[in-house]
Interface confidence: medium
């Protein structure tokens, strides 16, 4: 099996993890998508998921996790705000396609959260705190808590990640508090 690779994010407490999970637009636009954590020796645990079918540009918030699925860009945006040290771990985006196994998107995310310089959350990241406020109107979707253990060891198919590019601005239609729009789609 192909070795699964990881992309590592080293952040401080209080900061925001902001990642993009790109998918093949034609195949998966309306499919339900999820953000999972993978702990050693355990099945991937779903922390948040989009609605079923997934709605375009409609924020879904579960605690400090916000998911936004942009069908026209083939992009699931995942944000974890106000990070805590205990958020450290291995994460992945998946697409639910029952009865088949969930389809994993791109490399996994290795998140390492450390204490802020002054020990106070967000002490070195006030800009992100201001920019990525939690949307005032969000939906909480129901999703399977765990997926099959096969997802842990299964190699991903040849990349379907639409790893995108600079300068494709996304209009975040239901997110009134976001001041700036990311440049990459």
């Amino acid at each position: 099996a192909t070795k699964l690779t990881e992309e590592k994010y080293e952040l401080k407490e209080g900061q925001t993890l902001d990642v993009k999970c790109d998918y093949t637009l034609e195949k998966f636009a309306s499919s339900q998508k999820a953000w999972q954590i993978i702990r050693d020796g355990e099945m991937p645990k779903t922390l948040a998921c989009t609605e079923r079918p997934s709605k375009n540009s409609h924020p879904v918030q579960v605690g400090r996790i916000i998911l936004e699925d942009y069908h026209d860009h083939g992009l699931l945006r995942v944000r974890m705000v106000n990070l805590q040290v205990e958020d450290s771990g291995l994460y992945q985006c998946v697409i639910y396609q029952p009865p088949k196994e969930p389809h994993m998107l791109f490399d996994r995310i290795r998140l390492v959260v450390t204490k802020g310089f002054s020990g106070t959350p967000g002490s070195n990241e006030n800009s992100t705190q201001n920019v990525y406020k939690i949307p005032p109107t969000t939906t909480k979707a129901l999703c399977p808590l765990y997926t099959s253990p096969r997802t842990v060891t299964q190699a991903p198919p040849k990349s379907t990640a639409d790893v995108s590019t600079p300068d494709s601005e996304i209009n975040l239609t239901n997110v009134t508090d976001i001041i700036r729009v990311p440049v990459f789609n």
Partner: antibody
Framework: EVQLVESGGGLVKPGGSLRLSCAAS????????MNWVRQAPGKGLEWVSS????????YYADSVKGRFTISRDNAKNSLYLQMNSLRAEDTAVYYC????????????WGQGTLVTVSS | EIVLTQSPGTLSLSPGERATLSCRAS???????LAWYQQKPGQAPRLLIY???SRATGIPDRFSGSGSGTDFTLTISRLEPEDFAVYYC?????????FGGGTKVEIK
């Protein structure tokens, strides 16, 4: 292994045209949006243009808008940059680039192709 | 567009020394969208840091990034001979994506 190989550079007179190509391999090209970035001799880097995976979204730097056209052929795993009305200030090494899997930075670059605009 | 100003323009140091490179943005940039690149003569740029502080695959841990808002820093803890090159910062927070003018790290 991701590989990006540019070609098509050369010497052209002001007002002339040139078409650059970028051959991609080692990844599913049709699933990735792509970019052109250039670097004038002895100068810094400048983003030029980008195109989404299905060509639905196309963007240009103001300095090339109306003169350059980005396109792609997913069946051939190729990215193109058609450059018209070339000016001396377009002289540069042109790179095709792809961002990382989940972050907004150019992780993969070609070796570049030199375009010289001179009379 | 966001203008990124890098300083100093040239840094003259010896192998083993610590290098501190600065990148200042004309307006606030979320750290998720700030990257650093290394470029050697005749070569394409190489991604070092993304998200202001995360090292790209294969980058030695002597390279580290930090900062937020308008001020970002790339630090090379102990310069190796292969580290002498030009370094660029780049933002992808506001369209168009822009690069700093570069800092050349040369051997003293």
């Amino acid at each position: 292994e991701v590989q990006l190989v540019e070609s098509g550079g050369g010497l052209v007179k002001p007002g002339g045209s040139l078409r650059l190509s970028c051959a991609a391999s080692g990844f599913t090209f049709s699933s990735y949006s792509m970019n052109w970035v250039r670097q004038a001799p002895g100068k810094g880097l400048e983003w030029v243009s980008s195109i989404s995976s299905s060509s639905s979204y196309i963007y240009y730097a103001d300095s090339v808008k109306g003169r350059f056209t980005i396109s792609r052929d997913n069946a051939k795993n190729s990215l193109y940059l058609q450059m018209n009305s070339l000016r001396a200030e377009d002289t540069a090494v042109y790179y095709c680039a792809r961002r990382g899997g989940s972050y907004d930075a150019f992780q993969h670059w070609g070796q570049g192709t030199l375009v010289t605009v001179s009379s | 567009e966001i203008v990124l100003t890098q300083s100093p323009g040239t840094l003259s140091l010896s192998p083993g020394e610590r290098a501190t490179l600065s990148c200042r943005a004309s307006q606030s940039v979320s750290s998720s969208y700030l990257a650093w690149y290394q470029q050697k003569p005749g070569q394409a740029p190489r991604l070092l840091i993304y998200g202001a502080s995360s090292r790209a695959t294969g980058i030695p841990d002597r390279f580290s990034g930090s900062g937020s808002g308008t001020d970002f820093t790339l630090t090379i803890s102990r310069l190796e001979p292969e580290d002498f090159a030009v370094y660029y910062c780049q933002q992808a927070f506001i369209s168009p994506p822009t690069f700093g003018g570069g800092t050349k790290v040369e051997i003293k």
